[in-house]
């Protein structure tokens, strides 16, 4: 069962799945000036059996100008250089995501893919949040969200995370004045927020996201 919507938006935070449950779909989208190859799939799908999960299909982009040339799916060195790593303190040991039964790992990038990935998650998927560079986390509880099915409808649990600018410090996290409520923030105010993916996973995260490095964002 696919989740009706995307995980909640938290101001100045990004979210990331550490592994993708079977049934997850990833849009095959290309950056401007490129398009999917003719008869190329619109989606990659995480599928598998009891022992192994993998993405069916490969996303492929070709130049909009050149009608019949197929671009390779391996990223070029200069494309990889475009990505910037943001580290948080105390990195943990990486985990092999393939060891999670019924889950797929992050698909490798494909050449000329769009600047952000659009995933369609399934019920039971968990995503983890962290503050973007320049903001720090104030925790009221777990910085994670799970897609749950209740009364025949899907919903995401609300992550208990507030991201505050590093300049705004107070002695106790409890005294910190939140910048905005996690809910009800207008779409127009979230331009700094890059949700779902564009990340290469470097570590497993602690459930509360206290200690991890995990983002490698497109700029």
């Amino acid at each position: 069962e696919l989740c009706d919507d995307d995980p909640p938006e938290i101001p100045h935070a990004t979210f990331k799945a550490m592994a993708y449950k079977e049934g997850t779909m990833l849009n095959c989208e290309c950056k401007r000036g490129f398009r999917r190859i003719k008869s190329g799939s619109l989606y990659m799908l995480c599928t598998g059996n009891s022992s192994h999960s993998s993405w069916d299909n490969q996303c492929q982009c070709t130049s909009s100008a050149t009608r019949n040339t197929t671009k390779q799916v391996t990223p070029q060195p200069e494309e990889q250089k475009e990505r910037k790593t943001t580290e948080m303190q105390s990195p943990m040991q990486p985990v092999d995501q393939a060891s999670l039964p019924g889950h797929c790992r992050e698909p490798p990038p494909w050449e000329n893919e769009a600047t952000e990935r659009i995933y369609h998650f399934v019920v039971g998927q968990m995503v983890y949040y962290q503050c973007v560079q320049g903001y720090r986390a104030l925790h009221r509880g777990p910085a994670e969200s799970v897609c749950k099915m209740t009364h025949g409808k899907t919903r995401w649990t609300q992550p208990q995370l507030i991201c505050t600018g590093e300049m705004e410090t107070s002695q106790f996290p409890g005294e910190e004045k939140p910048q905005a409520s996690p809910e009800g923030r207008p779409e127009s105010e979230t331009s700094c927020l890059v949700t779902t993916t564009d990340f290469q996973i470097q570590t497993e995260m602690a459930a509360t996201m206290e200690t991890s490095i995990f983002t490698t964002e497109y700029q």
Partner: antibody
Framework: QVQLVQSGAEVKKPGSSVKVSCKAS????????INWVRQAPGQGLEWMGR????????NYAQKFQGRVTITADKSTSTAYMELSSLRSEDTAVYYC????????WGQGTLVTVSS | EIVLTQSPGTLSLSPGERATLSCRAS??????LAWYQQKPGQAPRLLIY???SRATGIPDRFSGSGSGTDFTLTISRLEPEDFAVYYC?????????FGGGTKVEIK
């Protein structure tokens, strides 16, 4: 709850253009996939194209390429479909719909092309 | 483009009967197939996506099956409100395409 609300009916002259709007509420508009589908009187459904606002990526059906433009305004959570060089056979109900499996639909906008 | 052929064009049945609608794709669409119900003057309503997953709020008398090129929508026991036109649609590759529709009418 997601809702897609479309602009009202239009009567246009052949050769002119029409711009239909689709305002979304609920969910994260910028990450929506907004599709446009039309239905001529008594006919079936026909896909015209789509946009993903956060990516600024549009795709169009070959039949409408060059004649249709799909745009999105993230600040107002509104998608637009503009069809130019109208002819009588473009008389149809135009729908916007979310995702590629069209889980939510607008109520439809009747565009009548008549001289 | 992928052509979807629906059959039969019209299905005449009585309330309480079972309806079986078919949709055949000109090439494989994997499980990227959806079914819609449309009543006169209304927008279509999503019934099934992913070939077999029921959309939110859809009664369990509606079920979908199949993968690849052959798909079926089954309405186990027709209710009076089920008489409508049904469309299949593929979203495996661009352009997205629809079948021509099957009208389920009261016999």
């Amino acid at each position: 709850q997601v809702q897609l609300v479309q602009s009202g009916a239009e009567v246009k002259k052949p050769g002119s253009s029409v711009k239909v709007s689709c305002k979304a509420s609920g969910g994260t508009f910028s990450r929506y996939i907004i599709n446009w589908v039309r239905q001529a009187p008594g006919q079936g459904l026909e896909w015209m194209g789509r946009i993903i606002p956060i990516l600024g990526v549009e795709n169009y059906a070959q039949k409408f390429q060059g004649r249709v433009t799909i745009t999105a305004d993230k600040s107002t959570s509104t998608a637009y479909m503009e069809l130019s060089s109208l002819r009588s056979e473009d008389t149809a109900v135009y729908y916007c719909a979310r995702k590629d499996w069209f889980d939510y639909w607008g109520q439809g906008t009747l565009v009548t092309v008549s001289s | 483009e992928i052509v979807l052929t629906q059959s039969p064009g019209t299905l005449s049945l009585s309330p309480g009967e079972r309806a079986t609608l078919s949709c055949r794709a000109s090439q494989s669409v994997s499980s990227y197939l959806a079914w819609y119900q449309q009543k006169p003057g209304q927008a279509p309503r999503l019934l099934i996506y992913g070939a077999s997953s029921r959309a939110t709020g859809i009664p369990d008398r509606f079920s979908g099956s199949g993968s690849g090129t052959d798909f079926t929508l089954t309405i186990s026991r027709l209710e009076p409100e089920d008489f409508a036109v049904y469309y299949c649609q593929q979203y495996g590759s661009s352009p997205l395409t629809f079948g021509g529709g099957t009208k389920v009418e009261i016999k």
